[in-house]
Interface confidence: medium
């Protein structure tokens, strides 16, 4: 009846993991396509959207024939997080306007909290060093306009959907490397 | 909305060059990897290469190594495509398209290069 | 010859379901995303479907798409006239260090 009190776990399948990993991922790249589509329904802006306090893009063509496991995770994970945060700042501070995007911003807020979960489980299982805890980030300033919060909220999920999409065909080629 | 437009292609001489250029707009151009695709007369699509969003990292099919280079300036939203020891069956539609990851996920409409004596 | 193998045409009647294949080894289809693109008449590629079964803004959920080990199919349901274009599958070849296409497959509407 099962392993006794103390006895290793097995661990499960590297492969498997980081399926379900992929799977996560394309479900919450697929998520932040469908909010993009009423993002700039409800509030069309053309051109460039920036914003500088976002992570500058960490893969492409280039860099993915040199990945390494470890270094993925790591910068995944932490530019991940760093769209959480963002992600939660602009559920603080949108104004009115931008409370028509709710609940579907919160949901996306959960589902990226649970890929960083998953991601840091896979690091683990993985036996990749864990990252000691990120220093408090400075808080990022409120939007100065309904419009600059607008601009953020596209640049925002416009970065996120770029990352997931590179991190959807990161995480397929490393699956083939292990 | 994204747009690419690409420019320059025309009739060309075997074993003259060309410059294409792709005028990108609608979307952060130097967040992107860009891509060069063909299609010559009746026939399939084949990929010809691609420059990274920095332009730091290029790849290229076998088929134009040595011949063709593509570079960008980012400071304009463009990309280009400069085609040296051209020859006939480098006749086709060149395209330029944006790549969000493995995919091509806006095309521009074509310009034509015809190598022809 | 292309690396990724389709049938160079396929046809059906409005309202029927079509499915086009798309044959690939370990190197392509078995260790990347597959991606399909249509092609209307004198126009240029669009997206039509992106790491192997996802839609793009904008493409109707007619169209959907499947991988199994190393090959891959684009089906298309509730078949319509405007629907009559050339489809491409393609994916990045790891042996290549490219992106490889399929030929392509013709399809007619019929009637």
């Known amino acids: 009846p099962g392993p006794p009190p103390g006895s290793p776990r097995a661990s499960p399948d590297p492969r498997a993991e980081l399926d379900s990993t992929v799977l996560l991922t394309r479900s919450l790249l697929e998520d932040t396509r469908q909010l993009t589509i009423q993002l700039k329904d409800k509030f069309p802006a053309d051109g460039d959207h920036n914003l500088d306090s976002l992570p500058t893009l960490a893969m492409s063509a280039g860099a993915l024939g040199a990945l390494q496991l470890p270094s993925v995770l790591t910068r995944l994970r932490a530019d991940l997080l760093s769209y959480l945060r963002h992600v939660q700042w602009l559920r603080r501070a949108m104004g009115s306007s931008l409370k028509t995007l709710e609940p579907e911003l919160g949901t996306l807020q959960t589902r990226l909290d649970r890929l960083l979960r998953r991601l840091q489980l896979l690091m683990s299982r993985l036996a990749l060093p864990q990252l000691p805890p990120d220093p408090p980030a400075p808080p990022l300033a409120p939007p100065s306009s309904t419009w600059g919060g607008i601009r953020a909220a596209h640049a925002i999920l416009g970065g996120l959907h770029l990352t997931l999409d590179w991190a959807v065909r990161g995480l397929l080629l490393l699956k083939t490397r292990l | 909305e994204v747009q690419l437009l690409e420019s320059g292609g025309g009739l060309v001489q075997p074993g003259g060059s060309l410059r294409l250029s792709c005028a990108a707009s609608g979307f952060t151009f130097s967040h992107y990897d860009m891509n060069w695709l063909r299609q010559a007369p009746g026939k399939g699509l084949e990929w010809v290469g691609v420059?990274?969003?920095?332009?730091?990292?290029?790849f290229y099919a076998d088929f134009v190594k040595g011949r063709f280079t593509i570079s960008r300036d980012n400071s304009k939203n463009t990309l280009y495509l400069q085609m040296n020891s051209l020859r006939a069956e480098d006749t086709a539609v060149y395209y330029c398209a944006r790549t969000p990851g493995s995919h091509f996920d806006y095309w521009g409409q074509g310009t034509l290069v015809t190598v022809s004596s | 010859q292309s690396v990724l193998t389709q049938p160079p045409s396929a046809s059906g009647t409005p309202g029927q379901r079509v499915t086009i294949s798309c044959s690939g080894s370990?190197?392509?289809?078995?260790?990347?995303?597959v991606n399909w693109y249509q092609q209307l008449p004198g126009t240029a590629p669009k997206l039509l479907i992106y790491?192997?079964?996802l839609l793009p803004s904008g493409v109707p959920d007619r169209f959907s798409g499947s991988k199994s080990g190393t090959s891959a199919s684009l089906a298309i349901s509730g078949l319509r006239s405007e629907d009559e274009a050339d489809y491409y599958c393609?994916?990045?070849?790891?042996?290549?260090?490219?992106?490889?296409f399929g030929g392509g497959t013709k399809l007619t509407v019929l009637g």
């Open positions: 393609s994916a990045w070849d790891d042996s290549l260090n490219g992106v490889v």
């Open positions: 370990s190197s392509n289809i078995g260790n990347n995303a």
């Open positions: 420059i990274s969003y920095d332009g730091s990292n290029k």
């Open positions: 790491y192997d079964d």
